[in-house]
Structure formats: structure tokens, C-alpha cells
């Protein structure tokens, strides 16, 4: 069946694919192009009500923080 | 170049726990686009992934063997391990470390692998 | 679970010859499918990513197409080096799954 990650299972999924990022639970502010305050699609809705893949958890990894100059 | 070798015993007893380290040479396990996998191999059979960690330390399990497995880095040592507790007869294998770039370069696939240790389970 | 598929799961061929493998997927992973060549005694080695990309040292006989849930491995003039097994790799989702293999023999 499709695949779902819920609870543990998915903070472990995040972890592993985000790295050293980190992550976010919803989608940062700003994210997409809508200027409307719309209902925030969270992680939880996505992955553990729906099929996940990794492209889609990949979407709630935190930005790289820049390096900093020397 | 980068290279994996995987080392342990070739041997290990039904009930107990198989131990196996991939020491990764020719290169830094830090970078933050690799992250490193298990796959075993049963003898004439096809490939099955096991799971993966990344230098911090974060794993991800296939869940058809989560509660056996567990994955550890030792960034000191270049080193990532594997160990299975409660192994039977069905865990016998060829057990292979990958690398697997990840997030970085936008794919997941195993670009680099050991050569591979025969594990026997066995009385 | 990604089920993974591959027809024929045995091919007898002659150098030369062209040899096509498929593999399907148990629904869509969009382009994310890795093929491998493995050699008796060896490890698997990465040939296709993102279902057409070749890897780096690959030779060009080897290509890869497909999309969806369906995928094709294409060697178009095989040499005695290419007769080994190949497996298909989702890329998708969790937990990665590989195909049961094609094995490619000297006819």
C-alpha cells in the first residue's frame, strides 16, 4: 500500500533525510507562492494521512545555514 | 579514491547479536552529502537494504528488521557499524556498506560499495 | 512496501547482441530508479540513475528510459563483460527496494 510514516517513525525519517538541517514540522513562512493566510499543510497531514516519498520530506528540511567567512 | 571495507565475524550462532564495521578510506565520512547504507544479500538471492546513517548520527531502519537494528558512526575512526541482535539462519548472507548521496545531490541511489563479508548464522 | 519487479528474470544472449530489461514499479516513483550490474563474487555497481542518467565510467552501450511505474535497461551491443545479474533500485520512498534481478548468460 502506499507508504506513510507517522509518530516516531516519521521524526526518525526526517532526521535521517534533513541531516544536520533540521527541520520543520510546517512549511517555513513564505513558503509557496500564496499570499492568503491558507491553512499551513503540516508534515503530519502529508506523510501520515497520505503516501510520502522522499522529495516530500525533503520539503520540510530546514535551509543550510551559510558557512561563515573567515 | 573513496573506498569501503567491511569487516566482522563470519560466523555468529542462532539467538546472538551479528556485528559488522565498513572503515571508509580515501576519504572523510563527514561530508554532508554522503550518507552510508547496509544492504545484505542472502546466498543466490537478490539485494535487500537494511538502512542507513548519516555522520551525525541520524539512522532510518526498514522497518521489516527496526526492532533488531542498530546503526552507529565513529567519525574518530572513519567507521560506521552494524549490529543485529537476535539473528537466526534466515540472516545469513552477504552484507555489503554503501555509500548513498543524499539530500545535497538530490538522489538516493548507491554509488559506492564494499566488497561484501559473508555472514554465516549458525551452531 | 515499493514492490519491485523484472522481466525476464533470465536472458540468454551472444555478444552483440542487444538485450533489453524492464522493471516495474508497484506504483509511480516518477524518474527515481537506479539499475546495477553485479558480476558473480563481486559487488553490485551503479550503472543508471534517475532512471536515464549514466553514471560516471559507464560505458554508452548501457542506457536507461522509462517513467511512472515502468522502466527499461538497454544494452545495445552486449560484450563479454556485461554477462551478470541486474537489478532495479526505487529511490522514492522509503524503505528503498531493489528488484529480484535479470541475469544475463552466454547463450
Known amino acids: 500500500g502506499p507508504e506513510t510514516l507517522c509518530g516516531a517513525e516519521l521524526v526518525d525519517a526526517l532526521q535521517f533525510v534533513c541531516g544536520p538541517r533540521g527541520f520543520y514540522f510546517n512549511k517555513p513562512t513564505g513558503y509557496g507562492s500564496s499570499i492568503r493566510r491558507a491553512p499551513q499543510t503540516g508534515i503530519v497531514d502529508e506523510c501520515c494521512f497520505r503516501s510520502c516519498d522522499l522529495r516530500r520530506l525533503e520539503m520540510y528540511c530546514a535551509p543550510l545555514k551559510p558557512t561563515k567567512a573567515a | 579514491q573513496l573506498q569501503l571495507q567491511e569487516s566482522g565475524p563470519g560466523l555468529v550462532k542462532p539467538s546472538e547479536t551479528l556485528s559488522l564495521t565498513c572503515t571508509v578510506s580515501g576519504g572523510s565520512i563527514n561530508s554532508s552529502s554522503n550518507y552510508w547504507g547496509w544492504i545484505r544479500q542472502p546466498p543466490g538471492k537478490g539485494l535487500a537494504w537494511i538502512g542507513g546513517i548519516y555522520y551525525s548520527g541520524s539512522t532510518y531502519y526498514n522497518p521489516s528488521l527496526r526492532s533488531r537494528v542498530t546503526m552507529s558512526v565513529d567519525t574518530s575512526k572513519n567507521q560506521f557499524s552494524l549490529k543485529l541482535s537476535s539473528v537466526t539462519a534466515a540472516d545469513t548472507a552477504v552484507y555489503y556498506c554503501?555509500?548513498?548521496?543524499?539530500?545535497?545531490?538530490?538522489?538516493?541511489?548507491?554509488?559506492?560499495w564494499g566488497r561484501g563479508t559473508l555472514v554465516t548464522v549458525s551452531s | 512496501d515499493i514492490q519491485m519487479t523484472q522481466s525476464p528474470s533470465s536472458v540468454s544472449a551472444s555478444v552483440g547482441d542487444r538485450v533489453t530489461i524492464t522493471c516495474r514499479a508497484s506504483?509511480?516513483?516518477?524518474?527515481?530508479l537506479a539499475w546495477y550490474q553485479q558480476r558473480p563474487g563481486k559487488a553490485p555497481k551503479l550503472l543508471i540513475y534517475?532512471?536515464?542518467s549514466l553514471q560516471s565510467g559507464v560505458p554508452s552501450r548501457f542506457s536507461g528510459s522509462g517513467s511512472g511505474t515502468d522502466f527499461t535497461l538497454t544494452i545495445s551491443s552486449l560484450q563479454p563483460e556485461d554477462f551478470a545479474t541486474y537489478y532495479c533500485?526505487?529511490?522514492?520512498?522509503?524503505?528503498?527496494?531493489f528488484g529480484p534481478g535479470t541475469k544475463v548468460d552466454i547463450k
Open positions: 533500485q526505487q529511490a522514492n520512498s522509503f524503505p528503498f527496494t
Open positions: 534517475t532512471a536515464s
Open positions: 506504483r509511480g516513483i516518477s524518474s527515481w
Open positions: 554503501a555509500r548513498q548521496r543524499g539530500h545535497s545531490s538530490g538522489w538516493w541511489y548507491f554509488d559506492l
